[in-house]
């Protein structure tokens, strides 16, 4: 897939929502240029797709929610690319341009006539893209032409800023909240010196930006802090590991703001260098309790504790998903694609990929095989209904008493439709409310997720906990099989009684060396040794001094023992 | 700071041979110590590793045969199915930090004759 | 895996000369080279870490360089004391490795 030819998933209707799903993977290095996008995906790709499709057919069949209003949509792919993503966003505004300049009569053909070319409907809203960064530049251009946008998994602090992101909504939470999160579980575990990573990009230097200044305020130091982007090479990814390697044994733990691809790379690169075991990542919820991030590296992520956001598993969606066969559907233009990625076999009479697989797909092949449901499924169901129920509340509004679309919504108002959607609240797929605060952020609750091995090599992410609005619950015991196996993550060890902290000069509040007091000094504070007042010695505990009791000679007691320094 | 290796002698085929280094002013916690070997006359050959962590590491070729452990003092190297293609010299080395990297301070070595 | 090619195997020098020893890593290794010294009957000893860092002790005669793939290890103003066995080891990856030494170089000084 490169930048010559995009394809669209299409759906007619009365109203079109825009969509940006990464169908594909991001560029590699050398292919960032070309735009030309990786392989095919699943979970954040193929299965939002359908969850579009198919969740607008619901929303068309239900006869309370825009009633005489048939939803459709426009599906891009953002390749998980801002470059790719921008490219698709402006195709989504062509069409609007187009579309409105022709309501108003300015489509004319060269020689003076009207035309009778009808374009395609403006796109009124557009849901996603999925990371950060890529919705950023989306945003930058949607919100010139007043098109409101909703994002399932774009978690970046800096996407509440009304002022510079008008248009932006999302039924996640900021990851202002997950960073706390992340805080919370390091304390938890007393690991006061940890090491950082990020993402390169939005999502990770925002995310790690308040992981760090919320530790400073609880006093956990970090060793250093790395960056690094996705799609970085081997090379760059050994280079990052070889690094946090040198703040061993202290810094164990390794927070990781960071996409699924960056902890995958990380964990490649342990298997390269043999460092599996050296360190607990602690992951956010760009890792969360996906597969295909750990898949082949379990034993590299064995111990490591990720953030999710709550998004239970839509039952509903399974049930449509896992029938889907590529005989049948062909309203998802990836489809064919994805079977022969998924399957690694030919299809028959479906050109694209026929080089690549030898054996031709079987009948019997079935999605129930290995079938994972992308973790933030919920979410992106929910940012659809969003966009449904904004409509529909703008309808009953804008058209009181009447059926479908007045001419009142015709074209839609891209301001009135905002604000209908900022005051939108129903109940989500998961039961949960879904309601928007005044910076078009949803609250925040995570999951606690441990990737354990649960048997001689199987392995799987179990719930240890959760964070709901300021509130860590864990269960320790599941975490670690006894206390003693708690890991350590600390650069100095706590001073002996009678000893002070000594902080080397350009080394960070959590590593120092022990000094003891001097003999007639006590421990004043941690960091400073004080000497008794003339008359009095420091305690047994040397927290104090107490004063010496004065004893008088008296007549008849015998002659103080003394030694002359003559005396040999 | 030292390292010492101690153990070796002359064994037959097949006999099993445990070598100790004993370190002195080293906190086996925070380093990695290695195994190197020099059969007479050639080069350097890599054996393994054991982390600050306890984590083991070892050459493609070790198969299984040889094993490394270590108490807060000592780092063992256990051997067994030994042929003559293992007679060598067996160095212990401390390695630059908690996990593999350079080796900056070696012990003498110790002689390790396999021989029918 | 991360194979050490040495060379030459060995190289005669004279007194003042210099003296040029490379070594190839199969692939790249990122810096994570180092030059060690061993003379007959005992144990090697660190000269370069990190491709290009002298280690303690050690004379500025002993220069290393390169990157990637490609290293070398330059002795200028040989003397007599540096006739010796040299060896590179790469620092990178101990999984998967056949020997993270190179096949040494035996410089001989006239």
């Known amino acids: 897939q490169s930048s010559e030819r995009r394809v669209v998933a299409h759906m007619p209707g009365d109203i079109i929502i825009g969509a940006l799903f990464s169908v594909h993977h991001q560029p590699t290095v050398d292919k960032v240029h070309e735009r030309k996008c990786g392989a095919v995906r699943e979970q954040y790709g193929i299965q939002r797709v359908e969850a579009m499709l198919h969740t607008l057919e619901r929303i068309n069949s239900d006869p309370t929610l825009l009633p005489n209003i048939t939803l459709g949509c426009e599906i891009r792919d953002s390749c998980w690319h801002s470059a790719v993503a921008l490219e698709q966003s402006i195709e989504f505004i062509r069409d609007s341009l187009i579309s409105s300049e022709e309501e108003e009569g300015l489509v004319r053909c060269v020689d003076g006539s009207s035309s009778s070319f009808r374009s395609k409907k403006p796109i009124v809203g557009v849901i996603g893209p999925g990371s950060s960064s890529v919705a950023i530049q989306v945003q930058n251009l949607l919100q010139l032409f007043n098109i409101p946008q909703i994002a399932y998994s774009a978690t970046s602090m800096d996407l509440s800023d009304k002022t510079l992101f008008k248009y932006f909504m999302r039924v996640v939470p900021s990851d202002a909240q997950q960073a706390r999160a992340m805080v919370d579980i390091v304390k938890r575990y007393n690991w006061t010196y940890v090491s950082a990573v990020h993402t390169e990009g939005n999502y990770g230097e925002s995310g790690m930006e308040a992981f760090k200044d919320m530790s400073a305020k609880e006093g956990i130091c970090i060793a250093h802090s790395y960056k690094i982007y996705s799609n970085a090479g081997e090379q760059s990814f050994d280079k990052l590991l070889k690094k946090l390697t040198s703040h061993l044994p202290k810094a164990r733990v390794v927070a990781c703001f960071c996409e699924g691809m960056t902890v995958r790379g990380l964990l490649m690169a342990m298997r390269r260098l043999g460092l599996a075991g050296e360190f607990l990542l602690l992951g956010s919820d760009g890792w969360a309790d996906r597969y295909d991030v750990t898949d082949g590296y379990q034993r590299e992520a064995v111990g490591g504790i990720t953030i999710k956001l709550q998004s239970p598993d839509v039952k509903w969606f399974d049930d449509y998903y896992l029938k889907l066969r590529p005989e049948t559907n062909h309203r998802n233009p990836w489809f064919q694609e994805f079977w022969q990625h998924r399957f690694q076999c030919r299809l028959e009479g479906f050109p694209q990929e026929n080089s690549k697989y030898n054996k031709t797909c079987d009948s019997s092949l079935t999605l129930k095989t290995h079938h994972v449901q992308d973790s933030k499924m919920g979410f992106v169901i929910n940012a659809i209904y969003s966009m449904a129920y904004g409509l529909h509340n703008m309808q009953m509004s804008l058209c009181p008493g009447y059926a479908g679309l007045c001419d009142a919504m015709k074209p839609i108002d891209g301001r009135k439709l905002l604000e209908s959607l900022m005051k939108t609240n129903f109940t989500g797929v998961s039961g949960d409310m879904i309601l928007f605060d005044e910076n078009g952020d949803s609250p925040g609750r995570y999951e606690i997720m441990n990737f354990k091995e649960m048997g001689k090599d199987y392995f799987d992410y179990i719930n240890v906990g959760s964070w709901d609005n300021g509130e860590l619950k864990m269960d320790d015991d599941e975490v670690w099989s006894k206390k003693s196996n708690i890991i350590r993550s600390v650069c100095s060890e706590p001073c002996e009684k009678g000893q002070i902290k000594v902080i080397r000069k350009g080394e960070v509040s959590c590593c120092w060396t022990c000094t003891p007091c001097k003999e007639n000094e006590y421990v004043f504070d941690e960091y400073t040794c004080k000497a008794c007042q003339l008359g009095s010695w420091p305690t047994d505990d040397l927290t104090g001094c107490d004063l010496i009791p004065v004893q008088y000679l008296r007549w008849g007691d015998p002659e103080p023992d003394y030694k002359d320094d003559d005396d040999k | 700071q030292s390292l010492e290796e101690s153990g070796g002698r002359l064994v037959t085929p097949g006999t099993p041979l445990t070598l100790t280094c004993t370190v002195s002013?080293?906190?086996?916690?925070?380093?990695?110590v290695g195994w190197v070997r020099q059969a007479p006359g050639k080069g350097l050959e890599y054996i393994g590793i054991?982390?600050?962590?306890?984590n083991t590491w070892y050459a493609s070729w070790v198969k299984g045969r040889f094993t490394i452990s270590k108490t807060s003092t000592t780092v063992d190297l256990k051997m067994t199915s030994l042929t003559t293609e293992d007679t060598a010299t067996y160095f212990c080395?401390?390695?630059?930090?908690?996990?593999?990297?350079?080796?900056?301070?070696w012990g003498p070595g110790t002689l390790v004759t396999v021989s029918s | 895996a991360y194979d050490m090619t040495q060379t030459p195997a060995s190289v005669e020098v004279a007194v003042g000369g210099t003296v040029t020893i490379k070594c190839q890593a199969s692939?790249?290794?990122?810096?994570?080279l180092a030059w060690y010294q061993q003379k007959p009957g005992q144990p090697p000893k660190l000269l370069i870490y990190?491709?290009?860092d002298l280690a303690s002790g050690v004379p500025s005669r002993f220069k290393g360089s390169g990157s990637g793939t490609e290293y070398t290890l330059t002795i200028s103003g040989v003397q007599c004391d540096d006739a010796a066995t040299y060896y590179c080891?790469?620092?990178?990856?101990?999984?998967?490795?056949?020997?993270?030494f190179g096949g040494g170089t035996e410089v001989v000084v006239k």
């Open positions: 080395a401390r390695g630059h930090g908690a996990t593999y990297d350079y080796f900056n301070l």
């Open positions: 002013g080293i906190d086996l916690s925070s380093y990695a």
């Open positions: 054991i982390y600050a962590s306890g």
């Open positions: 692939q790249s290794i990122s810096s994570w």
């Open positions: 990190d491709a290009s």
């Open positions: 080891q790469q620092g990178l990856a101990t999984a998967n490795v056949d020997n993270v």
